[in-house]
Interface confidence: medium
């Protein structure tokens, strides 16, 4: 049969057990939902002073870092289906390509975009958060990359394993070290230049920076001071821009940018590294 | 058997176990030395700055919020052992309360302690925090305080229970609100009031405050400006205690020792319902 | 408070060195993200941006003048120079210095230095 | 390309200026205010914001290519020259709009 032929039938067969089987979706609806609301709660009403600065560089990396911890549990994805997809790849049933491509179109691409869009359309206006259109899908579009780029990252490291709980683990401990050179536990700028380039595997790095660059962009954060005169705020952060470029973010629109071509990198890299390892699994089995 | 016999006999055994089965403890020293030399290397040097400020924020969250999620392992301490629990206390062989004392006293005591000791070795030194002795060892006692009472809290779940990934999803799923209320995601000033009564159920939050409070007092942020005059930005945080205020923190001694004594309250209420869960476990059993 | 100062020759000839100095106060070039740049504005007509400087030394320059413009920085002393060769009549503009942070706009200015260049 | 070159307005009359870039600048555009014998004063910047200071009657909109400044009730203090600066790549200034009084 056809590469198409195969792909329909294996995201059919993937949709129908998702619909099948709705309470872990509708369970994890639930709970996104339920944590944005006390998100939403806690961080109500943002404003424009020294303690804007704070919670909102904090709730971005909250959103950032939930992002990439509750997609470990896309390590179940390969690893549960493993004897399965074993016993019908060598039965002739479809091609690992089919395979690996409807387990992605059917199962990840829609759990891992909801939680996104729900977070976003909750916590955005909720914080009130920059009120512009541009800014609200940059933030959507941000937290599906990050989600993305995690959920590949699990994918990678998974796939061929038979036990879930060692690479979820594996999992953890790298995202522990990612979430520490995101960008708000330590200032990238003063990290020493023998141990600063490990901030470019760091996935909520990027989602982090962008998110920060979407939202800090034009703010001010000195009610009623005049910034233009002789300003005796010299150790003050009054602007968005300030901030920034204190955390070592480049203002340019490549410096928003270049983050989601570097999770998109990400992204085909772990991908590739998962779609090799079900090839490499087939062979040995 | 006395009480004090049946005590030693658990505590001998447990010590035993231990020493015999070594490759957990000192893998488990190993891991702490490593993440203190790693988070060391990171923030080593803290700067007098603006970054002074973030990086030392950053660091002491950090220390706090792995001391609580690294105590959830202390959930496997009874219920690995429920069934021997069981089957010894029917036959006799000691009270309720030796065992549970005799427990705590050559497991969790030991265990918990060590990684306090060695990170505030380690780290202290690298960072460059607070040249004080006193400082040294609140630090160290805070920690150490935060240890036992996550791992208290994770006892009071756990015991009575038959397996151990409940009671660690329902401990994760705690630390990461107790996490959100800490202080450093959000300036607690600035949640709503309704909600704000939240933060008093937080461990992480009593001992960053008590690492804030301690690390922060008596510093300067802003190089070349004489922060003993009257400071003339409203907006520039210059001194410790300009930051400790902006985060909503007594200045005064029982600012910092409140911490301690809300953390000792919470170990000796989350013991208690530990104890009383193994009472009520023996009653059924 | 932030403070900048620019001082230069006044008037010279048409082929001399004109030699520009900033002198601030209130903040660092050594600082994360402080920058300070050159902009003229010739009698009667708009403003021209020149040149950057920033806390690391890197340079920038308006390409249109690239190669005749050297811009360089004394971080101890607190002051910033613009160095324009073989300058001409054109080039009679009041000189400002401006404090800027990264490639953010302009907020802290100088009052301006007048150069004419007149033989 | 900064229109128009000058500008006669009334007191309390509305005033537009308009800045078109050449490409997409982003939105990283900024307005000045200069008066005679001073340094041009920061009003707004990356499109929208207002500088701290700035009255609310000036307001500024935008996105791509396109950029307009307003004045939404010219006061005899607002008599002076504006400015754009677009600040994506380096820095470059519109020509000017010399804003008077009928």
């Known amino acids: 049969t056809s590469f198409c032929h195969q792909l329909r039938w294996v995201s059919k067969r993937s949709f129908k057990n998702l619909l099948g089987n709705p309470q872990a979706s509708i369970a994890q609806i639930i709970v996104t939902v339920v944590l944005g609301l006390v998100i939403g709660a806690i961080y109500f009403g943002l404003k424009n002073d020294s303690t804007g600065i704070q919670n909102r560089a904090g709730v971005l990396f909250f959103l950032t870092t939930n992002q990439c911890f509750s997609s470990v549990s896309a390590v179940e994805l390969f690893v549960v289906e493993k004897k399965l997809f074993i016993h019908e790849y060598i039965s002739g049933y479809y091609r690992v390509s089919s395979y690996f491509l409807g387990k992605l179109l059917s199962d990840l691409l829609p759990m891992r975009m909801l939680p996104s869009i729900i977070f976003t359309c909750i916590v955005y206006f909720m914080l009130g958060l920059k009120p512009k259109a541009d800014a609200f899908f940059v933030m959507m579009f941000t937290l599906m990359m990050v989600a993305y780029s995690a959920s590949s990252m699990a994918l990678a490291i998974a796939a061929g394993q038979s036990v879930v709980s060692v690479a979820t683990l594996l999992m953890t401990i790298c995202f522990v070290f990612m979430m520490i050179f995101s960008g708000l536990l330590v200032n990238l700028t003063t990290i020493a230049s023998w141990l600063s380039w490990l901030q470019y595997f760091s996935i909520p790095r990027y989602g982090f920076t962008a998110l920060q660059h979407n939202e800090f962009l034009g703010q001010n954060f000195c009610p009623g001071l005049n910034a233009t005169g002789n300003n005796p705020c010299n150790y003050a952060t009054c602007t968005g821009e300030e901030y920034l470029v204190k955390q070592g973010i480049d203002l340019s629109p490549w410096g928003l940018w270049k983050n989601h071509v570097a999770l998109a990198c990400m992204i085909v890299i772990f991908l590739t590294i998962a779609y090799l390892k079900l090839l490499f699994l087939k062979k040995y089995s | 058997t006395s009480f004090c016999h049946q005590l030693r006999w658990v505590s001998k055994r447990s010590f035993k176990n231990l020493l015999g089965n070594p490759q957990a403890s000192i893998a488990q020293i190993i891991v702490t030395v490593v993440l203190g030399l790693v988070i060391g290397a990171i923030y080593f040097g803290l700067k007098n700055d603006s970054t002074g400020i973030q990086n030392r924020a950053g660091v002491l969250f950090f220390l706090t919020t792995n001391q609580c999620f690294s105590s959830v392992s202390a959930v496997e301490l009874f219920v690995v052992e429920k069934k021997l629990f069981i089957h010894e206390y029917i036959s006799g062989y000691y009270r309720v309360s030796s065992y549970f004392l005799g427990k705590l006293l050559s497991d969790l005591l030991p265990m918990r302690m060590l990684p306090s000791i060695i990170f505030t070795c380690i780290v202290y030194f690298m960072l460059g925090l607070k040249p004080k002795a006193d400082a040294f060892f609140v630090m160290m006692f805070t920690l150490m305080m935060v240890a036992y009472s996550a791992s208290s809290m994770a006892l009071a779940i756990a015991a009575g229970q038959s397996v151990v990934s409940v009671a660690t999803l329902l401990m994760t799923i705690c630390f990461v609100f107790m996490m959100i209320f800490s202080g450093l995601l959000v300036n607690l000033t600035t949640i709503a009031s309704w909600l704000s009564w939240l933060q008093y159920f937080s461990i992480p939050r009593y001992g960053f405050t008590a690492l804030q409070h301690n690390e922060f007092l008596g510093q300067n942020f802003c190089p070349g400006l004489n922060a003993t005059g009257n400071n003339p930005c409203n907006y520039a945080t210059c001194t410790g205690e300009e930051y400790l205020v902006k985060q909503g923190i007594d200045l005064s001694p029982w600012g910092l020792w409140k911490n301690h004594v809300a953390l000792a309250c919470m170990i000796v209420i989350f013991l208690t319902i530990a104890y009383l869960k193994l009472l009520f476990l023996k009653k059924y059993s | 408070q932030v403070t900048l100062k620019e001082s230069g020759p006044g008037i010279l000839r048409p082929s001399h060195t004109l030699s520009l100095t900033c002198s601030f106060s209130?903040?660092?070039?050594?600082?994360?993200?402080?920058?300070v740049s050159w902009i003229r504005q010739p009698s009667g007509k708009g403003l021209e941006w020149l040149a950057n400087?920033?806390?690391?030394?890197?340079?920038a320059y308006n390409p249109s003048l690239k190669n005749r413009l050297t811009i360089s920085k004394d971080t101890s002393n607190n002051q910033v120079f613009l160095r324009i060769p073989s300058v001409d009549t054109a080039d009679s503009a009041i000189y400002y210095c401006a404090r800027v942070f990264n490639n953010y706009p302009f907020p802290y200015w100088g009052q301006g230095t007048l150069v004419t260049v007149s033989s | 390309t900064q229109s128009p070159p000058s500008l006669s307005a009334s007191l309390g009359d509305k005033v537009t200026i308009t800045c078109q870039a050449s490409q997409n600048i982003n939105k990283y555009v900024a307005w000045y205010q200069q008066k005679p014998g001073k340094a041009p004063r920061l009003l707004i910047r990356?499109?929208?914001t207002l500088e701290s200071g700035t009255p609310s009657r000036f307001s500024g909109s935008g996105s791509w290519r396109d950029y307009s400044f307003s004045i939404s009730n010219v006061e005899s203090e607002d008599i002076a020259d504006y400015y754009c600066?677009?600040?994506?790549?380096?820095?470059?200034f519109g020509g000017g709009t010399k804003l008077e009084l009928k």
């Open positions: 990356y499109t929208s």
């Open positions: 209130g903040f660092s070039l050594t600082t994360y993200g402080i920058c």
């Open positions: 600066l677009q600040y994506v790549n380096l820095w470059t």
């Open positions: 400087i920033c806390w690391e030394d890197s340079k």
